[in-house]
Amino acid sequence: SPSGVRLVGGLHRCEGRVEVEQKGQWGTVCDDGWDIKDVAVLCRELGCGAASGTPSGILYEPPAEKEQKVLIQSVSCTGTEDTLAQCEQEEVYDCSHDEDAGASCENPESSFSPVPEGVRLADGPGHCKGRVEVKHQNQWYTVCQTGWSLRAAKVVCRQLGCGRAVLTQKRCNKHAYGRKPIWLSQMSCSGREATLQDCPSGPWGKNTCNHDEDTWVECEDPFDLRLVGGDNLCSGRLEVLHKGVWGSVCDDNWGEKEDQVVCKQLGCGKSLSPSFRDRKCYGPGVGRIWLDNVRCSGEEQSLEQCQHRFWGFHDCTHQEDVAVICSG
């Protein structure tokens, strides 16, 4: 599922042709089943207020380049999700750029309310990537790159519940420059602070920075796994956490090596190599099926290091949910 999402070609950043990012490549979304519920989620993810329409993506200039791929066949949201990645999706198999999806949102300047109050990552794809903004005396301020470090990024990511900080060379793109006052520079975080405001910094509002130097931060989406339905934490149906949502794993290609990685990651000893019948006693899951065709070498420390299809792409039902039994 996409790691980034944006709208391209509109009059403002909150309307345009829908583009998503997969493995560093931006591509379009087919309008197969695209409706106002999907747009509502997209607008929410981009901090763009309410959905106002589902225009065709071909209305927006310049059109998608020929070599740019259509990456997603269909998105099916209930309308309550926080990000497009949390919605059911299909890998593309029958689409062209004539059918690119578009979206328009009501309020280009509205912003999602960040959790917690006090810091947010704005204008990014979701709340875990974007331009750093800090709230001070009811006003949002940007943060200058001068003196910024990966340690400071770690604090922000932790504060937002967004997992680990990612080292990135990305700068704020021209369309995402801040229009707010610049709060401060010379942040000197140790990385252990609970909030960004706890880090020593230069004086409030006193600096020579401009918005070219706004800080951009990217955090990893927190990944976790668990075994559910068993009589202890080391046996049960496997569920993984992605984009804040728990989902199951399909048993296609699943075997001993994959079992071992799960047991190792959970600190549950070795796999007991359960029989097919034993694996089925935990019943089918509900909700998302996040992973399919997982392939591990057995050396990995975490299941997220194993190969698999894009998140959310599968050809499975919950009857094929993986269960794992470890020695404990």
Epitope: G33, K69, S76, E91, V92, Y93, D94
Partner: antibody
Framework: QSVKESGGRLVTPGTPLTLTCTVS????????MSWVRQAPGKGLEWIGL?????SASYASWAKGRFTVSRTSTTVDLNLTSPTTEDTATYFC???????????WGQGTLVTVSS | ELVMTQTASSVSAAVGGTVTISCQSS???????WSWYQQKPGQPPKLLIY???TLASGVPSRFKGSGSGTQFTLTISGVQCDDAATYYC??????????FGGGTELEIK
Amino acid sequence: QSVKESGGRLVTPGTPLTLTCTVSGFSLSSSGMSWVRQAPGKGLEWIGLTFPSGSASYASWAKGRFTVSRTSTTVDLNLTSPTTEDTATYFCAHVGATTGRDFWGQGTLVTVSS
Amino acid sequence: ELVMTQTASSVSAAVGGTVTISCQSSQNIYNNRWSWYQQKPGQPPKLLIYQASTLASGVPSRFKGSGSGTQFTLTISGVQCDDAATYYCAGGYSGTIFTFGGGTELEIK
């Protein structure tokens, strides 16, 4: 747009067989390709689909019995251990379920018999 | 697993008449991915209708697809001799998996 299957022949049960589908006039980098089979005098059965990314989806009955793979111009269907029930004409197709762009080959006959 | 049921294995119609072929699915079809195919002996299937009611390129307007939810219908009005064939409904559901109905043979009286 043209689609052509090849590789169909008489095989004994358990002998792996690979069918190849060659396409021209459209790009596999943006089109998923399906394999569909039809036993003599019977209906159509969808087997599986390979995506532009190279990954694949299968009908639940076909998992483990078939594998679908692709290169830039061909799509292969591997019958891992055929049985007599796999005797059929195998079609390669771009199924236009959402766009109407629907292209099928003429099919290739596989006979599994001892 | 999605099951597509065509209750009639064969139907007949007179030239110039109208015939209806029905198809039922075991669950709602994802994003209206209903299709109808026509197949004549020794030939591959030919797409007639996609997205439940959209006529495929080059298909005469005598062919009409309708329905919603789990019930879909192919109607052929002004039946011609050339329409003698087997007709299959097809459905797609989430996970990009397709299923065909068992087929209905149309005989021209």
